[in-house]
Interface confidence: low
Amino acid sequence: AITEAREEAKPYPLFPGPLPGSLQTDHTSLLSLPHTSGYQPALMFSPTQPGRPYTGNVAIPRVTSAGSKLLPPLAFKHTVGHIILSEHKDVKFNCSISVPNIYQDTTISWWKDGKELLGAHHAITQFYPDDEVTAIIASFSITSVQRSDNGSYICKMKINNEEIVSDPIYIEVQGLPHFTKQPESMNVTRNTAFNLTCQAVGPPEPVNIFWVQNSSRVNEQPEKSPSVLTVPGLTEMAVFSCEAHNDKGLTVSKGVQINIKAIPSPPTEVSIHNSTAHSILISWVPGFDGYSPFRNCSVQVKEVDPLSNGSVMIFNTSASPHMYQIKQLQALANYSIGVSCMNEIGWSAVSPWILASTTEGAPSVAPLNVTVFLNESRDNVDIRWMKPLTKRQAGELVGYRISHVWQSAGISKELLEEVGQNNSRAQISVQVHNATCTVRIAAVTKGGVGPFSDPVKIFIPAHGWVDHAPSSTPAPGNA
């Protein structure tokens, strides 16, 4: 709330000169007035345009006491209309009004640009009463003015539900130019035109703009703000700024770096994260992007094998994440891997090549000539097969996996057996009589389990019957 400092009634003469508490700035001068009858203003500031007609609201008070004497209209006295000052200076301005003593407890409020100024503002109201009227001076002070203090200030007083409004006091805070738009850093294509924008405001206006490139002025004649600088093109990095000038002085914008887009630097630190028989997971650290965002990357893979034709496999991938799983590789093979990335300008050189290997694969063929016999005397099933013809990449044979499924009267049960790589026969115990036994065999290497052979079925009768099943896959060359 606005603080009020009421003073005791003091026998001030009506026009002795400036009243205590009235404050002057460079823009105001107190007028000495002849002593005239009626309610002549006790205090008056010279308006910006002397003699201009008064435009404030007027309240016409009436007194209904004996004699029905009519009081003259109430109005704020003219004051300075326009205060111009520099940023960070202090300012104090006031409005004054003489109010007949019939009106008690009037309050004055300050408003700026249509909004009431509440709270921690330096507003003081002083009262100078005499017999018939009280001169009221409302002062408003701002320390270290800022641009945000610019605006139109008025006083308002409420009497008998009528509002009396003063003439506005325009505060204009002048200072160095203030940037509303500064040039922005850019990444541009070599020898391609681009624009930079600079805008600054006062007051005071006008604001003139000079452009600076690498510490040298670009334009000899200033341009009125706002200014757009068209640069026809650059071949190397440059730093631009703009200077804004007004009557108060000069403000320099931030310097912005204009970079020339170039092809990226090659990726670095290509790393192997994981290898399987047919894939390798790699990552890399992207090189400098050449001031243009990466678009995509290319993973280049060469088989390191004297017998290979030296062809390069190329896998395109997004630039992020900096990781790629290379698939469709041969098992147990050596590869040389490089990465290159591109931006809008072009492709980087390839990263340093790194060596990587795939692991053993699983066998690709099943054991051959699988035959199954029932050995009734021992109550077991004999199984025989031929070693599959595996490729080197499948790795070393470590054994076989035998699947035997027993089916009887709607019940099915699968069992698995593992045998060593030197075996080409196995015996399994009969699990159920009067049932079908289906046998399949797969070769196993460190790389995994290969495909199972075609199923071979044998019927296990009740005791006293013998059955024999043929081989599942004929040996090569057999009809």
């Epitope: 990444n187 630097s265 670095t268 400098f288 992007d289 001031y291």
Partner: antibody, heavy 122, light 106 residues
């Protein structure tokens, strides 16, 4: 191999000046900004600011404005931290650290120096 | 400024075991957090950035997760060379570090 090698320990008196160095190798020095980080004994790490290794423009955090100065000798791929008018509370280990992103709004440190211990004692 | 609260300040663990360290930020840091390992006499080493992205060459035993204001870092199958101090760094708004967690053997 990317590395940042810092100068050796320093013993100074209050009021004196110290200048410590951070020599980079294994990468393009002027492509990655260089930061400085302070670790006082028994305290956590404090980011002091960074220097643009291309333009040489330093940026200081609020706590390190005034007595601290970052500089470069780009031809030698070396960054420097100078502390003027040393105080007892400057006794710390100072690390240089490379910012990970070359051109990015958000960045962290991917390579650090081994640290330089500065002791200020009368 | 954003504050980073790291816990615990020290931790005793067994070889082969798992440890979890957390960092809580004073406001949402949009997953912009990195984790470092620091051994005496050496410079800190970047392990993880962007909450969970493992730096090349860092073993898969190290991992990170989190979002918003809560982030965690873990080491599984602890090895002797993992004994060090670990700290986090937020880089969403300026840069602030966690106070660090000293990892020791039980």
């Amino acid at each position: 191999q990317i590395q940042l090698v810092q100068s050796g320990p320093e013993l100074k008196k209050p009021g004196e000046t110290v200048k410590i160095s951070c020599k980079a190798s294994g990468y393009t020095f002027t492509a990655y900004g260089m930061s400085w980080v302070k670790q006082a004994p028994g305290k956590g790490l404090q980011w002091m600011g960074w220097i643009n290794t291309y333009s040489g423009v330093p940026t200081y955090t609020d706590d390190f404005k005034g007595r601290f100065a970052f500089s470069l000798e780009a031809s030698a791929s070396t960054a420097f931290l100078q502390i003027n008018n040393l105080k007892n509370e400057d006794t710390s280990t100072y690390f240089c650290a490379r910012r990970a992103a070359v051109v990015a709004k958000y960045w962290y440190f991917d390579v650090w120096g081994t640290g330089t211990t500065v002791t200020v004692s009368s | 400024d954003i504050q980073m609260t790291q816990s615990p300040s020290s931790l005793f663990a067994s070889l082969g075991g798992k440890v979890i360290i957390t960092c809580k930020s004073s406001q949402d840091i949009n997953k912009r957090i990195s984790w470092y390992q620091h051994k005496p006499g050496k410079g800190p080493r970047l392990l993880i950035h962007s909450t969970s992205s493992l730096q090349p060459g860092i073993p898969l035993r190290f991992s990170g997760s989190g979002s918003g204001r809560d982030y965690s870092f873990s080491i599984s199958n602890l090895e002797p060379e993992d004994i060090a101090t670990y700290f986090c760094l937020q880089y969403d708004n300026l840069l602030t570090f966690g106070a660090g967690t000293k990892l020791e053997l039980k």
